[in-house]
């Protein structure tokens, strides 16, 4: 299927001009390659009329041009002084020959309709209303006023001043006069439909002295706006229907042959195909609203219509707006898993793509909720603190520059199952949807922390160990201290990774973290996790409570605990003379450093893991190390 997209049908009248926009995929080659507009002949050959190489055919000389808009990935063909000879089949395309990627466009140029010379033309959109002005002479002021619609032979009454109304105009037509002006009457027709189009005559008086005026009413279907979107990206339908329908229910539907199937409306209806990836947002009191769809699929391509009616369904004679959505399968958005599976008590690491050109954009993760019009409250973000109910179990890791950030959620429950969105404050096309499925755990977790009831005593040494299975042997293990701004990775290195081993003892693989001496700031959530390069894997969480020596070992409620802590960890105890100031200068404080420092995080993690020379003025130290016991046979 060609990734070029444009208007399928273009219609105009003689003497007018048209502007045809064609879309192409966002690649450097496409931006700079030849663009063309050609006319298809009976033989199937397509004769170039204009191209971006500067070619202009004789028949287009002085009346056409082709402009490339590389920043929008579009090119536009403007043709003026149209004649009926321009009616035909055309292609807009890309490539060195006219057999390249292209899109078929049908252009129809019709004659200007011949109307009586004094005819007043009103052009209105479907669903809108028209007020027809009917002037008359003063002597016809007392006479009957009327508006009729011309049919083949006669003129069928619409409304008159004796309050006679054609049944098909009841509730839609009214005849009135303004103020004291006795030389003009008005007829207003609302909820216009295609059937209302045609020639009308308004009349005041009877016989030869009657005042008559010819009116041509044109009722137009709105021109569909073209939307060119990448597979897996998102689209927003901005619907502006006007103040007159501000209080009506709104809907978005997709054309399906003769009907328009509602996808979503403000009365709570939603197509199951769009579950988890659609929101409808009323914008203001002027009848404006928008519908956002993420995770676009190729089957989402088609003709969409928005409208307003108390039923929340399409209704003839009510204002609409239309779009033609094209889904480009040559997507720049990477193909990621759209369903992530986890188990109760376990964890998931979700890789969220973002536009690599916008590495400094703010990253967010929100949970889609379908109640009402649907909404997606942010749970975590690069500058947004973790929501309270996710304390200790949710963090966002931004890997600057590589087009991916990771969201980790652990201590999973079945209530976490649902739809989540990855989004940034930058390129909105890169909003993606993930469905999280959570099954009941049927086996022990891969990562286990001991001791499980972790209460550390102030001033003493406290060690927690994280046991991992052999399958994680080659992966990097880490501990991090969680705060509502993220999980600061604690520098460590894996002793066992440097040793050669023949076998792996399932029971003895562990990575330990030592707090020495324990301080009050150490209280909070800690995570043990595995990762391979920038790809995060499983995690498990433990809450470490801190008590004074004198007190018993009563458990501190994790949600009441202060989760903020210093992050200054190393593998072994270091000289206590290292000052606090020096300590702060250590690079890579973790992925949730303040914005000023975050630029330096980049590739220093590797360097940091090896050095482990941080300390603090009061002689505290933290250590994190891996121990492997090898059995040689």
């Amino acid at each position: 299927k060609s990734p070029i997209f444009g208007p399928q049908e273009v219609s105009s009248i003689e003497g007018d001009s048209v502007s045809i926009t064609c879309y192409y995929p966002d690649t450097s080659v496409n931006r700079h390659t030849r663009k063309y507009w050609c006319r298809q002949g009976a033989s199937g050959m397509c004769t170039t009329l204009i191209s971006s190489n500067g070619y202009l055919s004789k028949e287009y000389s002085g009346r056409a041009n082709l402009i490339n808009f590389p920043e929008n990935n579009t090119f536009v063909i403007n043709i003026e002084q149209l004649t009926q000879d321009d009616t035909g089949s055309y292609k807009c395309g890309l490539g060195t020959s006219n057999r390249g990627l292209s899109f078929d466009v049908s252009l129809e140029v019709s004659q200007v309709p011949e109307l009586p010379s004094d005819t007043h033309v009103y052009t209105k959109d479907i669903g809108r209303n028209v007020t027809i002005e009917c002037p008359f002479k003063r002597e016809n002021a007392p006479s009957k006023k009327s508006l009729c619609k011309k049919t083949n032979q006669s003129c069928e009454l619409v409304i008159d001043s004796t309050e006679k109304v054609n049944p098909s105009y009841i509730g839609r037509a009214k005849l009135f006069m303004k103020g004291t002006d006795l030389t003009v009457f008005y007829v207003n027709i609302s909820h216009l439909t295609h059937n209302d189009a045609g020639l009308y005559i308004c009349q005041a008086g009877e016989g030869p002295s009657a005042d008559k005026k010819n009116v041509d009413l044109q009722v137009l279907a709105p021109e569909p706006e073209l939307l060119y979107k990448d597979l897996r990206s998102s689209v927003t339908f901005e619907c502006d229907l006007g103040r007159e329908v501000a209080n009506e229910a709104k809907y978005l539907c997709r054309m399906n042959k003769e009907t328009c199937d509602v996808i979503i409306n403000t009365l709570g209806k939603r197509d199951p195909d769009f579950e988890g990836r659609i929101l409808i947002t009323p914008k203001d009191d002027n009848g404006r609203f928008s519908v956002l769809i993420t995770g676009l699929r190729k089957e989402d391509a088609g003709h969409y219509q928005c409208g307003a009616h108390s039923s929340g369904l399409p209704q003839e004679g009510w204002p609409i707006q239309t779009w033609q959505l094209f889904v480009n399968e040559e997507s720049t958005i990477p193909n990621r898993r759209s369903v992530v599976k986890g188990v109760t008590g376990g964890s998931v690491a979700i890789a969220c793509p973002y536009n690599p050109k916008e590495s400094s954009s703010l990253k967010y993760w929100c949970r889609w909720e379908g109640d009402g019009n649907g909404h997606c409250p942010v749970l975590v973000g690069t500058q947004a603190q973790v929501q309270e109910e996710y304390e200790g179990r949710l963090a966002l890791f931004d890997q600057p520059g590589n087009g991916t950030y990771t969201v980790i959620l652990n201590q999973l429950t079945t209530e976490d199952a649902g739809f989540y969105w990855c989004l940034t404050n930058g390129d909105s096309r890169w909003r993606t949807t993930i469905e999280l499925q959570v099954a009941e755990a049927t086996r022990e977790p891969n990562l286990e922390v001991t001791p499980q009831n972790a209460t550390a005593v102030l001033g003493e040494t406290f060690t927690v160990s994280c046991h991992y299975p052999c399958k994680f042997y080659s992966q990097e293990k880490y501990w991090c201290k969680w705060s509502n701004k993220g999980c600061h990775i604690l520098p460590s290195h894996d002793e066992g990774a440097r040793q050669s081993s023949v076998s792996c003892d399932q029971s003895s693989q562990l990575v330990s973290m030592t707090l020495n001496p324990v301080s009050k700031e150490d209280e909070g959530w800690y995570w043990c996790g595995v990762k391979q390069g920038q790809t995060y894997g499983e995690t498990t969480a433990i809450y470490i409570a801190v008590e004074e020596r004198t007190r018993g070992s009563s458990h501190v409620n994790p949600t009441d605990a202060n989760a903020r802590a210093k992050v200054a960890l190393e593998e072994e105890v270091v000289d206590s003379s290292i000052s606090e100031k020096e300590n702060k200068a250590i690079p890579n404080p973790g992925p949730f450093a303040n914005e000023r420092e975050i630029q330096n995080v980049g590739d220093q993690a590797q360097e940091n893991r090896a050095s482990g020379d941080a300390g603090s003025a009061d002689g505290q130290s933290r250590s994190s190390s891996s121990k492997h016991h090898h059995h040689h046979h």
Partner: nanobody
Amino acid sequence: QVQLVESGGGLVQAGGSLRLSCAASGRSFSSYNMVWLRQAPGKEREVVAAVTWSGGGTSYADSVKGRFTISRDNANVRVYLQMTGLKPEDTAIYYCAATQDWYGGSRAFRAASFHSWGQGTLVTVSS
């Protein structure tokens, strides 16, 4: 294709004004967006100003915004560059060129493909 010939360059004192003109021949002048570029000795060629085919849209380099004005006359197949408040750093050879590309900002025109160039006109601004 269009053939282009620039004129109007010369020596002017800082703060002074000049009007450059570019005469085009060829039947398709009105089909093109027109661009004024300049090249100072030892520097890269840069787009100074651009105007759309109809004259309805313009784009300027930050360094000349508010001082230079580009316009076109499709009937007389000409494009103009009105330069005021000239500075010594405006000294360069000025070229006009035709393109079918249109960018939002003049800097992006570096990637544009230009179909026709003039031979250039020298503007010297003395301090």
